[in-house]
């Protein structure tokens, strides 16, 4: 995270990762002021010539707000008042990547800090049980990711195999021509066994795993971001 | 090291038209906004226009404003001046200018242009 | 539109501290860049965002801002030191101060 205490008031953002097409949050907290009507908050983005966002007097002042933000920012209102101005960036953007500013004015004094804002697509893999196949494998799909991702299997029982050899990854563009689909197939699969599928850019880190035994199926799955410091 | 070069000026006579550039190296350019900022004989400087990284928005002085296009090439690394329709008041070092956020952190050694019949 | 008026000339002895306001209205709810040039030289940014020092500038060179004065303060200041300097804030396009003309006697 990135503080800036040297001015009078201390305002602290902390890096954060956006997915494409859904709503983001770039953090920012500061002392908090008494009077609202005290509090101005704006978002500037480096390489942008209008504001991103601007909240000042209990509102919002968007009258130089760049055209690229028009419609799909706001700040927690309600929240402004102890302390928070993070920003809620709407429909996020590839484009909206990039080095973005805090800059804070209330009735102590001002401060202002950094935060760097990644963008990209991830999504939660689910791993299944190819029964089409014609031996026993293991199928891991997760619907949206970019940049392209390195997709890994592993297994419990196997700790440290490099399973390159009998696995297969295809990657597929979306609708949207930005976004693929990841698909990867591991063969040779053994039952009473933990397989781990791991895919990972850099953005975000996601793993599906399937617990395969002669009585039942379990599936879980778990998404990580993998913020980098402001 | 981060470097910008004007170049283009000369001596031009009013009404005629002349183009700027500056070439930029050592950062990654179509991540930053720039500038072009003047300063005639014995005179203090003068904000000319802004463009963003990207280029989609641009802002003008009002003294240039209907005569003067700033534009980049991001695959060039180059930013641009056209300037239109000369005037006498118009002379003037130019010198291209990296912004950052409220500000700007580098400047280019300048280009002179002087508008005279 | 927004004005930024300086002094036309601040002079000082060598080893002295000098001092360079820059006035606009309310001028301390904005961010305030300071440059400095020498005669056939490009300007140089010596202090931005009211009071931070960009790397390779002295810590002689400081400034503060609010209300509706920003300051530029140089310490122990050298002949070196001589040049014009500019306040400088962001109002929908760069406004720059008047300048001023430092002189070490």
């Known amino acids: 995270f990135g503080i800036s205490g040297r001015h009078s008031i201390t305002v602290t953002t902390v890096a954060s990762a956006g997915n494409i097409g859904e709503d983001g949050i770039l953090s920012c907290t500061f002392e908090p002021d008494i009077k609202l009507s005290d509090i101005v908050i704006q978002w500037l983005k480096e390489g942008v010539l209008g504001l991103v966002h601007e909240f000042k007097e209990g509102k919002d002042e968007l009258s130089e707000q760049d055209e690229m933000f028009r419609g799909r920012t706001a700040v927690f209102a309600d929240q402004v008042i102890v302390g928070n101005a993070s920003l809620r960036l709407k429909n996020v953007q590839l484009t909206d990547a990039g080095t973005y500013k805090c800059y804070i004015i209330t009735s102590k004094g001002k401060g202002n800090a950094n935060l760097e804002y990644k963008t990209g697509a991830f999504s939660m893999p689910e791993v299944n049980v190819d029964y089409n196949a014609s031996s026993e494998t293991l199928r891991c799909e997760a619907p949206r990711w970019f940049p392209q991702p390195t997709v890994v299997w592993a297994s419990q029982v196997d700790q440290g195999a490099n399973f390159s050899e009998v696995s297969n990854t295809s990657f597929e563009l979306n609708s949207e021509n930005v976004t693929m689909k990841v698909v990867s197939v591991l063969y040779n699969v053994t039952i009473n066994n933990t397989y781990s599928c791991m895919i990972e850019n850099d953005i975000a880190k996601a793993t599906g795993d399937i617990k395969v035994t002669e009585s039942e199926i379990k599936r879980r799955s778990h998404l990580q971001l993998l913020n980098s410091k402001a | 090291e981060v470097q910008l070069v004007e170049s283009g000026g000369g001596v031009v006579q009013p009404g005629r038209s002349l183009r700027l550039s500056c070439a930029a190296s050592?950062?990654?350019?179509?991540?930053?906004?720039m500038n072009w900022v003047r300063q005639a004989p014995g005179k203090g400087l003068e904000w000319v226009s802004a463009?963003?990284?990207?280029?989609?928005?641009?802002y003008y002085a009002d003294s240039v404003k209907g005569r003067f296009t700033i534009s980049r090439d991001n695959s060039k690394n180059t930013l641009y001046l056209q300037m239109n329709s000369l005037r006498a008041e118009d002379t003037a070092v130019y010198y291209c200018?990296?912004?950052?956020?409220?500000?700007?952190?580098?400047w280019g050694q300048g280009t002179t242009v002087t508008v005279s019949s | 539109s927004y004005e930024l008026t300086q002094p036309p000339s601040v002079s000082v002895a060598p080893g002295k501290t000098a001092r360079i306001t820059c006035g606009g209205n309310?001028?301390?709810?904005?961010?305030v860049h300071w440059y400095q040039q020498k005669p056939g030289q490009a300007p140089v940014l010596v202090v931005y965002?009211?009071?931070d020092r960009p790397s390779g500038i002295p810590e002689r060179f400081s400034g503060s801002n609010s209300g509706n004065t920003a300051t530029l303060t140089i310490s122990r200041v050298e002949a070196g030191d001589e040049a014009d300097y500019y306040c400088?804030?962001?109002?929908?396009?760069?406004?720059f101060g008047t300048g001023t003309k430092l002189t070490v006697l």
């Open positions: 200018a990296r912004k950052r956020w409220y500000g700007m952190d580098v």
């Open positions: 050592g950062f990654t350019f179509s991540d930053r906004a």
């Open positions: 463009i963003s990284g990207t280029g989609a928005s641009t």
């Open positions: 309310n001028i301390g709810s904005k961010s």
């Open positions: 965002d009211d009071s």
């Open positions: 400088q804030v962001w109002d929908r396009g760069m406004i």
